[in-house]
């Protein structure tokens, strides 16, 4: 008995071939011997089966001795043994129809779980293997679960159902709703304007929800809400904003915030949350601000950084075009009695400069100039 696998919603073509290459009489029946379709001369006739409006054949092939049964918009319950009667012979074809669906919406928030459920006909024992867009393989039976979805899981999932050494492939498009970056860090000199951007990693027709930026300053004992906003069809409107600092927010996507001045008291880390309409859970992006200050007080030239820096970072003070006078893995370094000239304060990671601030040291009878 020939086995054919079909996909729910698809069209399948079951073949039946006669030895004579001409149009002769044939019938297709199901396992209950109910006629599905056949021919009467050159006319297609249909029986009383439940496939009536979904069954068809290809009359153009009859003259070649081919009498296929075409079933459109397959349903799981179409799984059956189909019998083709032609030339006093019976050809049996077992059709097994499978369906694979995502448990809920195919638009899921980062960190949520994806469950794929296999619909299969009674008596079948299929195995399923799915490959995610990033190449990760998961195997299972009737259900497959992937917890903690990541941004790289967005895209087409390819699932192969195996039964009776035959396979059928399903493709499911999954959209993981997330920010492009889970975390970002902004390095600024004191007094500079700060731009925070929160680009989304997905595009949808309409985007509605609400968001908030909570900020934990390094110098503060507790976090506070800096801004709350609404999102309606990709348009941003501010609901509430603190007076210090007075953030400004762009009116269109991507979400964009401007802090007028980088100051040591603002250095720290923030968490932007975005709750989307009709979705449970929230999108999160962490943002960090590191602020640098170079100062000269009497005979002491000091460079300091505030904010969440890595212990790998090196802070250096150097006279322009010279080797570093002091270079330490600290958040503050200083030079006593610095010689006159343009001094550079550098925050670097493996020699890659992340932040630089210049301060001009004048001869001892003058006061310093900050460019």
């Amino acid at each position: 008995k020939k086995v054919v696998l079909g996909k729910k919603g698809d069209t399948v073509e079951l073949t039946c071939t006669a030895s004579q290459k001409k149009s002769i009489q044939f019938h297709w029946k199901n396992s209950n011997q109910i006629k599905i379709l056949g021919n009467q001369g050159s006319f297609l006739t249909k029986g009383p089966s439940k496939l009536n409006d979904r069954a068809d054949s290809r009359r153009s092939l009859w003259d070649q001795g081919n009498f296929p049964l075409i079933i459109k918009n397959l349903k799981i319950e179409d799984s059956d043994t189909y019998i083709c009667e032609v030339e006093d012979q019976k050809e049996e074809v077992q059709l097994l129809v499978f369906g694979l669906t995502a448990n809920s919406d195919t638009h899921l928030l980062q960190g949520q779980s994806l469950t794929l459920t296999l619909e299969s006909p009674p008596g079948s024992s299929p195995s399923v293997q799915c490959r995610s867009p990033r190449g990760k393989n998961i195997q299972g039976g009737k259900t497959l679960s992937v917890s903690q979805l990541e941004l790289q899981d967005s895209g087409t999932w390819t699932c192969t159902v195996l039964q009776n050494q035959k396979k059928v492939e399903f493709k499911i498009d999954i959209v993981v709703l997330a920010f492009q970056k889970a975390s970002s860090i902004v390095y600024k000199k004191e007094g500079e304007q700060v731009e925070f951007s929160f680009p989304l990693a997905f595009t949808v027709e309409k985007l509605t929800g609400s968001g908030e930026l909570w900020w934990q300053a390094e110098r503060a004992s507790s976090s506070k809400s800096w801004i709350t906003f609404d999102l309606k069809n990709k348009e941003v409107s501010v609901k509430r904003v603190t007076q210090d600092p007075k953030l400004q927010m762009g009116k269109k996507l991507p979400l964009h915030l401007t802090l007028p001045q980088a100051l040591p008291q603002y250095a720290g880390s923030g968490n932007l949350t975005l709750a989307l309409e009709a979705k449970t859970g929230k999108l999160h992006q962490e943002v960090n601000l590191v602020v640098m200050r170079a100062t000269q007080l009497q005979k002491n030239l000091t460079c300091e950084v505030w904010g969440p820096t890595s212990p790998k970072l090196m802070l250096s003070l150097k006279l322009e075009n010279k080797e570093a006078k002091v270079s330490k893995r600290e958040k503050a370094v200083w030079v006593l009695n610095p010689e006159a000239g343009m001094w550079q304060c550098l925050l670097s990671d493996s020699g890659q400069v992340l932040l630089e601030s210049n301060i001009k040291v004048l001869p001892t009878w003058s006061t310093p100039v900050q460019p």
């Epitope: 790998k312 330490k328 893995r329 600290e330 670097s348 493996s350 020699g351």
Partner: antibody, heavy 118, light 113 residues
């Protein structure tokens, strides 16, 4: 497998220059600082300086200032250390080493023996 | 520059016994900003480049046997080999990477008694 492969041994006359290469394989060289460390026969380890192959930034130990130059060729994932005005006390094995994600030198080249002799 | 001084210069220990090497820095190599000790230990065998054993004073590099351990903070550090094996015969160096120039101890030669 991540490794740093250095050029072969060199014999130089006093006053000459030597250029030692260090090629990275199995790792993108630009993500890490590369330091150069030398070891005179039977002696300890001496740090000469570092280079960030991505930015081209360098930092040299005061002792070698003016005599050492570190350069890179990102297309071949190679860094170079050139030492000029060689003297007999520069006879040593020269190592390149990668400053790992946690700052210490986690991968070393096999070493290049430089002999300075008249 | 920070000067690193190791003691002893050489050490002979019986197989299976404990070996202890000390390292003292001329100034603290502990960062008050990050609460980290920027000290590493290396092992060097003849004709080979040094091999990283310990970083941040006490964190073992992956693949290093757990008989090697590091301790200490500020200016005083110790490398301990709990049960000496024949393959541990080498020269051991401490290194500070708290500030540049990076400096090494003079080395301690470990032999079997």
């Amino acid at each position: 497998q991540v490794q740093l492969v250095q050029s072969g041994a060199e014999v130089k006359k006093p006053g000459a220059s030597v250029k030692v290469s260090c090629k990275a394989s199995g790792v993108t060289i630009s993500n890490y600082a590369i330091s150069w460390v030398r070891q005179a026969p039977g002696q300890g380890l001496e740090w000469m300086g570092w280079m960030n192959p991505n930015s081209g930034n360098t930092g040299y130990a005061q002792k070698f200032q003016g005599r050492v130059t570190m350069t890179r060729d990102t297309s071949t994932s190679t860094v170079y250390m050139e030492l000029s005005s060689l003297r007999s006390e520069d006879t040593a094995v020269y190592y390149c080493a990668r400053e790992g994600l946690l700052d210490a030198f986690d991968i070393w080249g096999q070493g290049t023996m430089v002999t300075v002799s008249s | 520059d920070i000067v690193m001084t190791q003691s002893p210069d050489s050490l002979a220990v019986s197989l299976g016994e404990r070996a202890t090497i000390n390292c003292k820095s001329s100034q603290s190599v502990s960062s008050s900003s990050y609460n980290k000790n920027y000290l590493a230990w290396y092992q060097q065998k003849p004709g080979q480049p040094p091999k990283l054993l310990i970083y941040w004073a006490s964190v073992r590099e992956s693949g290093v046997p757990d008989r090697f351990s590091g301790s200490g903070s500020g200016t005083d550090f110790t490398l301990t080999i709990s049960s000496l094996q024949a393959e541990d015969v080498a020269v051991y160096y401490c290194q500070q990477y708290y500030s540049t120039p990076i400096t090494f101890g003079q080395g301690t030669r470990l032999e079997i008694k």
